[in-house]
């Protein structure tokens, strides 16, 4: 067990702070919840605090909730191979482009991190390039969200990960937005961190609202396992 | 805050705004950077101020620590294990808006005169 992988044992606040602009549209979101990587597991409620969001929210999971990726469940026999938590306490800057199909882009950076018992993730997202009456501006998208495969891989040269993955939204009309995810994750911190082999995190996730919030808002559940390594051979003749 | 170090010791910059610079939405970023003779004018690194997130070349990772002081309008940069190689002029720079895309010199409108690191070995 990693020391940052001690952390996780039990159930960990969680809290989310975003500052964005997307061309031009500035915005802050709040979220708070918490995670529990025994079962994978994250609840988290995010609120815009600047009135409407200028984008639909689905398009933000990647960025709240994908950001918080130590709470995924690693297998026993995968525990060698996550990053995310050998990187705790000091924790990770993550930084994504993110490639709408014949839309614009964000770029985010976050920093995720422990503060005392509270697991936070702090976030910009810079948007650009993205057409006004578009899916994203034009809120076409559907408020669901479909389940992904993430990919991960090393970065030995500096000392972290680099993550691919490209996410489905449902438009409106029956068809699909694709959004292109390029990650790379290093550690803050100088103390040593898991360098993984090739795999994958299987995420599920479900949107929803809160009947008594005004607010604009998102309720999120998630559930994230890894997988992609098998069992080594002194497993196998066990 | 500048000076004159031995190479391996350490110096603390400061740098005080006069006024709050931001955008309409409160948002501020401030940075150091640096320009040695002869050379273009680097970026060292920079500090969103709503979130306190920060940002650093490489060149300095894990020896150079920014911060600031909301309250009295002020930036820091803590300087360790210092290098021959980091003798510069060091400049504090501000604007308003995030700091994720504030990248080189051209980005920032409000600079400060600037203070002299000699680093000697």
């Known amino acids: 067990m990693s020391k940052g992988e001690e952390l996780f044992t039990g159930v960990v606040p969680i809290l989310v702070e975003l500052d964005g602009d997307v061309n031009g549209h500035k915005f802050s979101v709040s979220g708070e919840g918490e995670g529990d990587a025994t079962y994978g597991k994250l609840t988290l409620k995010f609120i815009c605090t600047t009135g409407k969001l200028p984008v639909p929210w689905p398009t933000l999971v990647t960025t709240f909730s994908y950001g918080v990726q130590c709470f995924s469940r690693y297998p026993d026999h995968m525990k060698q191979h996550d990053f995310f938590k050998s990187a705790m306490p000091e924790g990770y800057v993550q930084e994504r482009t993110i490639f709408f199909k014949d839309d614009g882009n964000y770029k985010t950076r976050a920093e995720v991190k422990f503060e005392g018992d509270t697991l936070v993730n702090r976030i910009e997202l810079k948007g650009i390039d993205f057409k006004e009456d578009g899916n994203i501006l034009g809120h076409k998208l559907e408020y669901n969200y479909n389940s992904h495969n993430v990919y991960i891989m090393a970065d030995k040269q500096k000392n972290g990960i680099k993550v691919n993955f490209k996410i489905r939204h449902n438009i409106e009309d029956g068809s699909v937005q694709l959004a292109d995810h390029y990650q790379q994750n290093t550690p803050i911190g100088d103390g040593p961190v898991l360098l993984p082999d090739n795999h994958y995190l299987s995420t599920q996730s479900a949107l929803s609202k809160d009947p008594n919030e005004k607010r604009d808002h998102m309720v999120l559940l998630e559930f994230v396992t890894a997988a992609g390594i098998t069992h080594g051979m002194d497993e196998l003749y066990k | 805050g500048g000076g004159s170090v031995q190479a391996g010791g350490s110096l603390r910059l400061s740098c005080a705004a006069s006024g709050y610079i931001s955008d309409s939405h409160g948002r501020n970023c401030m940075g150091w950077f640096r320009q040695a003779p002869g050379k273009e004018r680097e970026a060292v690194a920079r500090?969103?101020?709503?979130?306190?997130?920060?940002y650093y070349a490489d060149s300095v990772k894990g020896r150079f620590t920014i911060s600031r002081d909301n309250a009295k309008n002020t930036l820091y940069l803590q300087m360790h294990s210092l290098k021959p190689e980091d003798t510069a002029m060091y400049y504090c720079a501000a604007v308003g808006g995030l700091c994720i895309d504030k990248e080189t010199p051209t980005d920032y409108p409000f600079w400060g005169q600037g203070t002299q690191v000699t680093v000697s070995s």
């Open positions: 500090i969103y101020s709503r979130l306190g997130t920060t």
